[in-house]
């Protein structure tokens, strides 16, 4: 028998520095977690103790903090090289800055293979990107070889900016011939490493003949066997065992997100490459694990540029950006409109001639808007200003919801109106009229939404049975502020870009902004 240790991360999302327990900015260092310096300590400890170790990343290193905003992926290549990752799969967020934003900072600089079998380049890009990412890689590990095949969510064109010269194929269809090819190359131990979410990970384990282990990402799935060490609630045991269609037991793993855990899986193979046993658990990277001093020093060196960046002007406002709780928790506020407009703008993807865009709607809890921005400072808007407005380090995500769920969400928005509670929704691509004289749960008297399947966008009444795409904060997608109906009834959820980054990109693009209060939210009675 031959034993392999798989160390894995996924959805790190730019958390190079240690973070608080909820993966936001580290405040009290003695209680902080994760970060590449701490990760390196643990990885090195395991490499020294065990003979056959692979360090793998299942995608979405890009996007999530000011580190990515400033360094644009160069930080990912640098620190992943320093940690000596063995392979990485492409995630959807690796395309956030377009193909060039992937090629130059990461693909050309990484000293480890970057993989995806279901992304096919065409046209002029084919020769430019040739060899920079691979469908698979055969890695020598001790006296053996291990094949790693990569995959990426085929929804990437709707979630990011891969352009028109990359085709995202069905994962299973693309993986099978690569696995078959590996078998002709004498490779009898094969890991599928990819970024399509836990449901697809399980399908790959079930359907792709010859895959021995699946290491996934995208859905931020936390798996654990035994008592979990922090706040995350396990979605199942680690590893999650899938019985394949040809009768094999295939371990499937994922390691939550944000570099909070290091996935740790031990696999025992027989001489024919069959999995005999698999066990392990994610390792919580808490403060009991010291940060590696040399990596930490490097982080501090790279940090300097971030501090300079946060005070630089992104653009100007010529109007007061009203982000006060007195406005945003009670009525339409122009800060809410600005943020929603930025959220939609960030999701412009012309992937179908029938649609002017795949999504037109935004909702945003007023309680998530934490500060106004005064225009009387020469109109200057900085990252620092935006960090005061959006201090929680969240993301603006894409969900699919039925009209009936949206209606419930808008009822919830005003079910206890007047108490300055955070659930009051700011909107984009939506016209809502409330009648507060009616009883809670029946206050939405008009709800019109902007069409997507149209050449001239116009507002149509919401249809209860229709499925709509909506951009919203991850906080809402996860049921925050009492929006349990969103969490319970959403049909699809894909995590998006860092909230501040979305707004800062929009302001930089527009240069000068002047958002108005324009009648997106109306009240049919009372003095509003």
């Amino acid at each position: 028998a031959w034993e392999l240790t798989i160390l894995h991360t996924n959805d790190v999302h730019s958390r190079l520095e240690q973070t608080s327990e909820d993966s936001s900015k580290c405040v009290n260092a003695s209680r902080c977690m994760g970060g590449v310096a701490r990760l390196f300590t643990k990885v090195q400890q395991i490499r020294r103790a065990e003979p056959n170790v692979l360090l793998l990343d299942a995608g979405d290193q890009y996007q999530g903090t000011i580190w990515f905003t400033v360094y644009k992926g160069a930080e990912v290549a640098h620190f992943m090289n320093a940690l000596r990752y063995d392979a990485m799969a492409l995630g959807n967020h690796e395309f956030d800055n377009g193909v060039e934003g992937l090629i130059e900072p990461l693909l050309k600089e990484a000293k480890f293979p970057i993989l995806s079998a279901n992304i096919k380049a065409k046209g002029p890009l084919a020769s430019q990107i040739s060899g920079l990412y691979l469908p698979y890689k055969v890695l020598p590990v001790g006296d053996e070889v291990v094949g790693i095949v990569g995959y990426t969510s085929k929804e990437t064109p709707f979630l990011s900016n891969p352009g028109t010269n990359l085709v995202f194929e069905d994962e299973i269809t693309a993986l099978q011939p690569e696995v078959d090819k590996l078998k002709t190359l004498n490779v009898n131990k094969i890991i599928a490493l990819g970024h399509s979410g836990f449901e697809m990970d399980k399908l790959i384990a079930q359907k792709v003949r010859g895959v021995d282990v699946v290491v996934g990402g995208h859905s931020n799935t936390f798996l654990y066997t035994g008592n979990p060490p922090s706040k995350e609630v396990p979605a199942g045991k680690y590893p999650f065992i899938v019985t394949s269609d040809d009768g094999r037991k295939v371990p499937v793993v994922q390691a939550y997100a944000f570099g909070k855990y290091l996935g740790y899986l031990k696999i025992e193979f027989d001489e024919r490459g069959n999995v005999i046993s698999s066990h392990g658990n994610p390792i919580l990277l808490n403060s009991s694990i010291p940060e590696d001093p040399s990596i930490k020093a490097d982080i501090n060196k790279w940090r300097i540029k971030l501090d300079n960046y946060s005070t630089q002007e992104l653009g100007k406002t010529i109007v007061y950006l009203d982000g006060s709780s007195q406005s945003c928790r009670f009525r339409e506020c122009n800060m809410g409109n600005l943020i929603c407009d930025a959220m939609i703008n960030n999701n412009l993807r012309h992937t179908d001639e029938m649609f002017w865009n795949h999504v037109s709607m935004c909702i945003l809890n007023g309680g998530g808007i934490r500060s106004p921005i005064d225009e009387r400072n020469n109109g200057t808007i900085t990252w620092e200003n935006l960090a005061a407005v959006l201090p929680f380090g969240g993301t603006f995500d894409l969900v699919q919801l039925k009209g009936s769920t949206l209606k419930k969400a808008f009822e919830h928005s005003v079910h206890r109106y007047g108490q300055s509670t955070g659930e009051f929704l700011q909107v984009g691509g939506i016209h809502v009229v409330y009648d507060l004289s009616r009883k809670p749960g029946d206050r939405v008297v008009k709800l019109d939404v902007l069409c997507t399947k149209c050449r001239v966008p116009s507002y149509d009444p919401l249809k209860m049975d229709e499925v709509y795409k909506v951009i919203l904060p991850n906080f809402l997608a996860n049921g925050g502020d009492g929006f349990q109906m969103i969490k319970d009834e959403l049909l699809r959820h894909d995590s998006g870009d860092q909230d501040i980054n979305v707004v800062s990109t929009y302001i930089s693009k527009m240069k000068v902004i002047y958002p108005a209060v324009e009648g997106r939210i109306k009240f049919s009675t009372g003095s509003h």
Partner: antibody, heavy 120, light 110 residues
Amino acid sequence: EVQLVQSGGGVVQPGRSLRLSCAASGFTFSSYGMHWVRQAPGKGLEWVAVISYDGSIKYYADSVKGRFAISRDNAKNTLYLQMNSLRREDTAMYYCASGLTGVAGALGVWGRGTLVTVSS
Amino acid sequence: QSVLTQPPSASGAPGQRVTISCSGSSSNIGSNTVNWYQRLPGAAPQLLIYNNDQRPSGIPDRFSGSKSGTSGSLVISGLQSEDEADYYCAAWDDSLSGNVFGTGTKVTVL
């Protein structure tokens, strides 16, 4: 010593069948993908077929698809090529070869070849 | 019929440098590695270069390989009389799901 010893070649009439064998020694046969390659008189090398280490995956050149079948017996350390419906253009020196681990298209060890002549 | 194109012949005096090209497409050399074989008269082919530029043990360092885009090349830097042979490039072709060989190049030592 790593060796591939071939047998089974000869003269055969068009439309008939022939089975080539390739006996392996000196290495763990069951760990290697195996290939057949041929060279017609005065022509270049032409790849014929490959079989994975466990026999589960087989690929063929278009020119032999549906007529030739590659197989292996790991217990006997032997590779086979069953050639049916032979044509004159199948006349060639046939080589068996082992694939290099992890490198597509790289054949590390070759047999000395066996001649197949298809003639009436 | 070969999918990879090589010049039919190449020659040089002893000690000279000879380069053989191998042209393919995105489905073979473009997405896979190039391998080179030497076939001496009356002998079975032997692997000369694998993985674009790697030499198996026992292959002299005067043989070197490289790949760029959808082409590969083999360089014999100090030609010797025993290098007179046929040389073939090869690669896996993803659209054919099989190996493809080059047309072959006959190297003559003058």
